[in-house]
Protein backbone atom coordinates (compact mmCIF):
# COMPACT_ATOMS: atom_id res chain seq x y z
CA UNK A 1 0.00 0.00 0.00
CA UNK A 2 1.50 3.37 -1.02
CA UNK A 3 2.21 5.52 1.93
CA UNK A 4 0.18 8.73 2.15
CA UNK A 5 2.51 10.74 3.74
CA UNK A 6 4.17 14.05 1.85
CA UNK A 7 7.46 12.47 -0.08
CA UNK A 8 10.05 14.79 -1.11
CA UNK A 9 11.55 13.39 -4.27
CA UNK A 10 15.59 14.50 -4.36
CA UNK A 11 18.12 12.53 -4.04
CA UNK A 12 20.56 12.36 -1.23
CA UNK A 13 24.14 13.85 -1.97
CA UNK A 14 22.66 15.26 -5.16
CA UNK A 15 24.63 17.53 -7.61
CA UNK A 16 23.72 19.90 -10.72
CA UNK A 17 26.99 21.37 -11.99
CA UNK A 18 25.68 24.83 -14.24
CA UNK A 19 27.18 27.40 -15.42
CA UNK A 20 26.63 31.18 -14.47
CA UNK A 21 24.04 33.20 -16.88
CA UNK A 22 22.10 30.41 -17.93
CA UNK A 23 18.93 29.87 -17.17
CA UNK A 24 18.08 27.23 -14.73
CA UNK A 25 15.11 25.56 -12.84
CA UNK A 26 15.72 23.55 -9.07
CA UNK A 27 13.05 20.79 -9.00
CA UNK A 28 11.83 19.26 -5.71
CA UNK A 29 9.39 16.03 -6.62
CA UNK A 30 6.47 16.18 -4.56
CA UNK A 31 4.39 13.33 -3.93
CA UNK A 32 1.09 13.96 -2.19
CA UNK A 33 -2.41 12.15 -2.05
CA UNK A 34 -4.84 14.90 -1.84
CA UNK A 35 -4.24 18.43 -0.78
CA UNK A 36 -1.29 19.63 -2.06
CA UNK A 37 1.01 20.92 0.43
CA UNK A 38 2.48 24.42 0.98
CA UNK A 39 6.51 23.93 -0.16
CA UNK A 40 9.51 26.09 0.34
CA UNK A 41 13.04 26.46 -0.93
CA UNK A 42 15.77 27.32 1.54
CA UNK A 43 19.51 27.28 1.16
CA UNK A 44 21.97 26.15 3.45
CA UNK A 45 24.41 28.88 5.38
CA UNK A 46 26.24 26.22 7.62
CA UNK A 47 23.85 23.88 9.15
CA UNK A 48 20.90 26.41 9.44
CA UNK A 49 18.54 26.99 5.97
CA UNK A 50 17.80 30.09 5.07
CA UNK A 51 14.41 30.35 3.71
CA UNK A 52 14.23 31.74 -0.28
CA UNK A 53 11.86 35.05 0.13
CA UNK A 54 10.93 36.76 -2.77
CA UNK A 55 12.20 34.32 -5.46
CA UNK A 56 10.69 32.61 -8.95
CA UNK A 57 9.15 29.81 -7.90
CA UNK A 58 6.40 27.56 -9.92
CA UNK A 59 3.88 24.13 -9.72
CA UNK A 60 4.45 21.79 -12.46
CA UNK A 61 1.69 18.80 -12.42
CA UNK A 62 2.65 15.70 -13.71
CA UNK A 63 0.54 12.19 -13.53
CA UNK A 64 2.03 10.88 -10.28
CA UNK A 65 3.68 13.76 -9.01
CA UNK A 66 3.93 17.96 -8.95
CA UNK A 67 7.17 19.40 -9.20
CA UNK A 68 7.65 22.73 -7.34
CA UNK A 69 10.80 24.86 -8.77
CA UNK A 70 13.06 27.67 -7.46
CA UNK A 71 13.78 29.49 -10.70
CA UNK A 72 17.15 31.02 -11.53
CA UNK A 73 17.00 33.31 -14.62
CA UNK A 74 19.39 33.58 -14.95
CA UNK A 75 22.00 31.95 -12.62
CA UNK A 76 24.44 34.03 -10.53
CA UNK A 77 28.21 32.82 -8.99
CA UNK A 78 26.73 33.45 -5.75
CA UNK A 79 24.11 30.62 -6.28
CA UNK A 80 26.25 28.14 -5.39
CA UNK A 81 25.88 26.19 -2.55
CA UNK A 82 22.76 23.57 -1.24
CA UNK A 83 19.35 23.95 -1.33
CA UNK A 84 16.54 22.14 0.58
CA UNK A 85 12.99 22.06 -0.23
CA UNK A 86 10.61 21.74 2.83
CA UNK A 87 6.96 20.92 3.38
CA UNK A 88 4.06 21.70 5.23
CA UNK A 89 1.99 18.94 5.61
CA UNK A 90 -0.46 18.46 8.90
CA UNK A 91 1.29 20.73 10.72
CA UNK A 92 4.18 18.31 10.26
CA UNK A 93 7.45 19.77 8.20
CA UNK A 94 8.82 17.61 5.76
CA UNK A 95 12.75 18.40 4.51
CA UNK A 96 14.32 16.98 1.31
CA UNK A 97 17.68 16.24 1.18
CA UNK A 98 19.88 18.82 0.37
CA UNK A 99 21.14 19.10 -3.25
CA UNK A 100 24.06 21.10 -4.45
CA UNK A 101 24.74 23.23 -7.20
CA UNK A 102 28.02 23.92 -8.39
CA UNK A 103 28.27 27.16 -10.61
CA UNK A 104 30.70 27.82 -12.73
CA UNK A 105 31.10 31.53 -13.51
CA UNK A 106 32.63 31.04 -17.14
CA UNK A 107 33.50 34.70 -17.66
CA UNK A 108 36.51 34.03 -14.85
CA UNK A 109 36.85 30.24 -15.73
CA UNK A 110 38.05 30.86 -19.61
CA UNK A 111 37.49 34.61 -20.23
CA UNK A 112 35.02 34.30 -22.61
CA UNK A 113 34.02 37.20 -24.26
CA UNK A 114 30.40 38.88 -24.41
CA UNK A 115 28.12 38.64 -26.87
CA UNK A 116 28.53 42.32 -27.46
CA UNK A 117 32.84 41.44 -27.50
CA UNK A 118 32.19 39.24 -30.30
CA UNK A 119 29.87 41.22 -32.23
CA UNK A 120 32.54 44.15 -32.28
CA UNK A 121 35.47 41.06 -33.42
CA UNK A 122 33.68 39.39 -35.63
CA UNK A 123 37.50 37.54 -36.79
CA UNK A 124 36.98 35.13 -33.63
CA UNK A 125 33.79 33.94 -35.69
CA UNK A 126 35.96 32.13 -38.14
CA UNK B 1 11.20 -8.41 -11.58
CA UNK B 2 14.20 -6.48 -10.58
CA UNK B 3 17.47 -7.18 -13.51
CA UNK B 4 20.36 -5.50 -13.34
CA UNK B 5 22.48 -7.78 -16.11
CA UNK B 6 26.29 -6.76 -16.81
CA UNK B 7 28.11 -7.65 -20.22
CA UNK B 8 29.86 -10.81 -20.44
CA UNK B 9 33.45 -11.57 -19.59
CA UNK B 10 36.38 -9.59 -21.67
CA UNK B 11 40.12 -10.74 -22.17
CA UNK B 12 41.88 -7.76 -23.37
CA UNK B 13 45.53 -6.82 -23.67
CA UNK B 14 47.57 -4.17 -21.80
CA UNK B 15 47.14 -0.77 -23.56
CA UNK B 16 44.04 -1.35 -24.76
CA UNK B 17 40.15 -0.10 -23.39
CA UNK B 18 36.93 -1.91 -22.67
CA UNK B 19 33.58 -0.46 -21.71
CA UNK B 20 31.51 -2.22 -19.49
CA UNK B 21 27.55 -2.31 -19.51
CA UNK B 22 24.86 -2.87 -16.75
CA UNK B 23 21.32 -2.93 -18.15
CA UNK B 24 18.71 -2.42 -15.33
CA UNK B 25 15.24 -3.35 -15.27
CA UNK B 26 12.36 -3.36 -13.26
CA UNK B 27 12.71 0.28 -11.33
CA UNK B 28 13.04 3.74 -12.56
CA UNK B 29 17.00 4.02 -12.99
CA UNK B 30 16.19 8.17 -13.00
CA UNK B 31 15.75 7.30 -8.93
CA UNK B 32 18.97 5.31 -8.25
CA UNK B 33 22.57 5.81 -7.79
CA UNK B 34 24.56 3.70 -10.21
CA UNK B 35 27.71 2.77 -8.35
CA UNK B 36 30.93 0.66 -10.15
CA UNK B 37 32.75 -1.99 -7.88
CA UNK B 38 36.04 -3.74 -7.70
CA UNK B 39 36.75 -7.05 -6.89
CA UNK B 40 40.54 -8.37 -7.75
CA UNK B 41 41.31 -11.59 -7.48
CA UNK B 42 40.88 -13.08 -3.95
CA UNK B 43 40.64 -9.78 -2.57
CA UNK B 44 37.74 -7.36 -0.99
CA UNK B 45 35.30 -5.18 -2.90
CA UNK B 46 36.75 -1.88 -3.69
CA UNK B 47 34.45 1.40 -4.80
CA UNK B 48 35.28 2.85 -8.01
CA UNK B 49 32.44 5.92 -8.59
CA UNK B 50 28.52 6.88 -8.98
CA UNK B 51 26.37 8.23 -11.47
CA UNK B 52 23.04 10.06 -11.49
CA UNK B 53 21.71 8.71 -14.23
CA UNK B 54 19.05 11.82 -14.37
CA UNK B 55 21.38 14.32 -14.72
CA UNK B 56 25.11 12.70 -15.65
CA UNK B 57 26.44 14.00 -12.47
CA UNK B 58 29.34 11.67 -11.59
CA UNK B 59 31.33 11.10 -8.41
CA UNK B 60 34.74 9.10 -8.72
CA UNK B 61 36.88 7.49 -5.69
CA UNK B 62 40.56 9.56 -6.39
CA UNK B 63 42.16 5.87 -6.61
CA UNK B 64 40.44 5.73 -9.35
CA UNK B 65 40.30 9.17 -10.96
CA UNK B 66 41.47 9.53 -14.49
CA UNK B 67 41.98 5.83 -15.24
CA UNK B 68 37.87 5.21 -15.71
CA UNK B 69 34.69 7.11 -17.21
CA UNK B 70 31.07 6.13 -15.46
CA UNK B 71 28.62 6.90 -17.54
CA UNK B 72 24.68 6.51 -18.19
CA UNK B 73 21.93 6.35 -21.02
CA UNK B 74 18.78 6.85 -18.96
CA UNK B 75 16.32 6.39 -22.27
CA UNK B 76 18.26 2.41 -22.11
CA UNK B 77 18.37 2.45 -18.69
CA UNK B 78 21.75 1.48 -19.10
CA UNK B 79 25.05 2.70 -17.04
CA UNK B 80 28.53 2.12 -18.24
CA UNK B 81 32.02 1.49 -16.88
CA UNK B 82 34.78 2.51 -19.39
CA UNK B 83 37.97 0.98 -18.80
CA UNK B 84 41.06 3.02 -20.77
CA UNK B 85 44.94 1.87 -21.15
CA UNK B 86 44.15 -1.55 -19.63
CA UNK B 87 46.88 -3.01 -16.94
CA UNK B 88 47.17 -6.69 -16.40
CA UNK B 89 46.41 -5.37 -12.19
CA UNK B 90 43.06 -4.39 -14.17
CA UNK B 91 42.52 -7.82 -13.81
CA UNK B 92 39.49 -8.36 -11.38
CA UNK B 93 35.83 -8.90 -11.35
CA UNK B 94 33.49 -5.50 -12.11
CA UNK B 95 30.21 -5.10 -10.36
CA UNK B 96 27.42 -2.36 -10.76
CA UNK B 97 24.86 -2.01 -7.82
CA UNK B 98 21.98 0.25 -8.36
CA UNK B 99 20.92 2.20 -5.05
CA UNK B 100 17.59 4.10 -4.38
CA UNK B 101 18.59 7.62 -4.12
CA UNK B 102 15.91 9.34 -1.81
CA UNK B 103 15.15 6.79 0.89
CA UNK B 104 17.91 3.91 0.05
CA UNK B 105 14.77 1.72 0.07
CA UNK B 106 16.49 -0.87 -2.25
CA UNK B 107 19.78 -1.52 -3.22
CA UNK B 108 20.29 -4.47 -6.36
CA UNK B 109 23.82 -5.77 -7.56
CA UNK B 110 24.29 -6.97 -10.70
CA UNK B 111 25.96 -10.54 -11.46
CA UNK B 112 29.87 -8.89 -12.94
CA UNK B 113 32.39 -8.80 -15.40
CA UNK B 114 35.06 -10.78 -15.52
CA UNK B 115 38.17 -8.84 -17.19
CA UNK B 116 40.88 -10.33 -18.03
CA UNK B 117 43.81 -8.20 -18.86
CA UNK B 118 46.91 -10.35 -20.71
CA UNK B 119 49.63 -10.04 -23.24
CA UNK C 1 39.28 8.65 3.17
CA UNK C 2 37.64 6.93 6.04
CA UNK C 3 39.08 3.52 7.02
CA UNK C 4 36.37 0.51 7.74
CA UNK C 5 37.81 -2.02 9.90
CA UNK C 6 36.22 -5.32 10.49
CA UNK C 7 36.93 -7.63 12.97
CA UNK C 8 37.50 -10.41 13.00
CA UNK C 9 39.03 -11.21 9.58
CA UNK C 10 37.81 -14.69 9.88
CA UNK C 11 35.11 -16.45 12.18
CA UNK C 12 33.86 -20.13 12.99
CA UNK C 13 30.51 -20.69 14.47
CA UNK C 14 28.67 -23.88 14.99
CA UNK C 15 25.23 -23.94 13.24
CA UNK C 16 22.35 -22.91 15.52
CA UNK C 17 24.85 -20.63 17.80
CA UNK C 18 25.33 -16.77 17.17
CA UNK C 19 27.77 -14.99 15.08
CA UNK C 20 28.89 -11.22 15.58
CA UNK C 21 30.85 -9.35 13.68
CA UNK C 22 32.23 -5.81 14.07
CA UNK C 23 32.74 -2.90 11.74
CA UNK C 24 34.59 0.15 12.98
CA UNK C 25 35.03 3.16 11.22
CA UNK C 26 37.65 6.00 11.16
CA UNK C 27 35.07 8.87 11.67
CA UNK C 28 31.48 9.29 12.38
CA UNK C 29 29.24 8.47 9.97
CA UNK C 30 26.32 10.22 11.07
CA UNK C 31 25.30 12.24 8.08
CA UNK C 32 24.17 16.02 8.64
CA UNK C 33 20.44 14.93 7.57
CA UNK C 34 20.95 12.79 11.74
CA UNK C 35 20.71 9.31 9.85
CA UNK C 36 23.74 7.18 9.37
CA UNK C 37 24.56 5.46 6.28
CA UNK C 38 25.80 2.11 6.73
CA UNK C 39 25.63 -0.78 5.21
CA UNK C 40 26.20 -4.65 5.42
CA UNK C 41 26.06 -7.02 2.45
CA UNK C 42 26.94 -10.63 1.94
CA UNK C 43 28.67 -12.23 -0.57
CA UNK C 44 28.45 -16.25 -0.85
CA UNK C 45 31.00 -18.16 -2.83
CA UNK C 46 31.06 -17.33 -6.65
CA UNK C 47 27.95 -14.95 -6.31
CA UNK C 48 27.78 -11.16 -6.06
CA UNK C 49 27.27 -9.60 -2.79
CA UNK C 50 23.90 -9.07 -1.61
CA UNK C 51 22.44 -5.91 0.46
CA UNK C 52 21.68 -7.17 3.53
CA UNK C 53 21.05 -4.47 6.16
CA UNK C 54 20.77 -0.24 5.78
CA UNK C 55 20.83 2.84 7.99
CA UNK C 56 22.69 0.50 10.41
CA UNK C 57 19.80 -1.72 11.50
CA UNK C 58 17.06 -1.62 8.40
CA UNK C 59 16.48 -5.39 6.99
CA UNK C 60 16.11 -5.53 3.07
CA UNK C 61 12.86 -7.06 1.98
CA UNK C 62 13.56 -10.96 1.71
CA UNK C 63 16.32 -10.94 4.48
CA UNK C 64 15.76 -13.90 7.60
CA UNK C 65 15.01 -12.11 10.31
CA UNK C 66 17.76 -13.74 12.33
CA UNK C 67 19.90 -11.21 10.83
CA UNK C 68 20.17 -7.80 12.56
CA UNK C 69 22.39 -4.51 12.34
CA UNK C 70 22.89 -2.16 15.58
CA UNK C 71 24.99 0.70 16.05
CA UNK C 72 26.24 4.64 15.95
CA UNK C 73 28.38 6.78 15.37
CA UNK C 74 31.73 4.79 14.56
CA UNK C 75 30.84 1.23 15.70
CA UNK C 76 28.32 -1.34 14.21
CA UNK C 77 28.01 -4.97 14.69
CA UNK C 78 25.93 -7.19 12.24
CA UNK C 79 24.47 -10.13 14.48
CA UNK C 80 23.27 -13.41 13.25
CA UNK C 81 21.12 -15.08 16.37
CA UNK C 82 21.35 -18.73 14.82
CA UNK C 83 23.78 -19.56 12.48
CA UNK C 84 22.53 -21.52 9.58
CA UNK C 85 24.43 -23.91 6.69
CA UNK C 86 23.22 -20.94 3.53
CA UNK C 87 24.73 -18.32 5.82
CA UNK C 88 28.23 -19.50 4.61
CA UNK C 89 29.83 -15.97 3.19
CA UNK C 90 32.42 -13.16 3.41
CA UNK C 91 30.07 -10.11 4.63
CA UNK C 92 31.44 -6.58 4.33
CA UNK C 93 30.55 -3.18 5.62
CA UNK C 94 29.97 -0.23 3.33
CA UNK C 95 29.61 3.15 4.50
CA UNK C 96 27.87 6.02 1.74
CA UNK C 97 27.75 8.80 4.29
CA UNK C 98 30.96 10.15 2.80
CA UNK C 99 33.27 10.28 -0.23
CA UNK C 100 34.82 8.31 -1.09
CA UNK C 101 32.63 5.36 -0.17
CA UNK C 102 34.47 2.52 1.50
CA UNK C 103 34.38 -1.19 2.58
CA UNK C 104 35.39 -2.98 4.94
CA UNK C 105 37.96 -5.73 4.22
CA UNK C 106 35.54 -8.25 4.96
CA UNK C 107 34.82 -11.03 7.14
CA UNK C 108 34.82 -14.88 6.35
CA UNK C 109 32.27 -16.87 7.95
CA UNK C 110 32.45 -20.04 7.72
CA UNK C 111 30.99 -23.21 9.62
CA UNK C 112 32.83 -25.01 12.86
Known amino acids: KESCDVQLYIKRQSEHSILAGDPFELECPVKYCANRPHVTWCKLNGTTCVKLEDRQTSWKEEKNISFFILHFEPVLPNDNGSYRCSANFQSNLIESHSTTLYVTDVKSASERPSKDEMASRPWLLY | EVQLVQSGAEVKKPGESLKISCKTS????????IHWVRQMPGKGLEWIGRNDPANGNTKYSPSFQGQVTISADKSISTAYLQLSSLKASDTAMYYCASYEGYYERFGYWGQGTLVTVSS | DIVMTQSPDSLAVSLGERATINCKSSQSLLDRDGKTYLNWLQQKPGQSPKRLIYLVSKLDSGVPDRFSGSGSGTDFTLTISSLQAEDLAVYYC?????????FGQGTKLEIK
Open chain 3, 94 to 102: WQDTHFPYT
Open chain 2, 26 to 33: GFNIKDTY
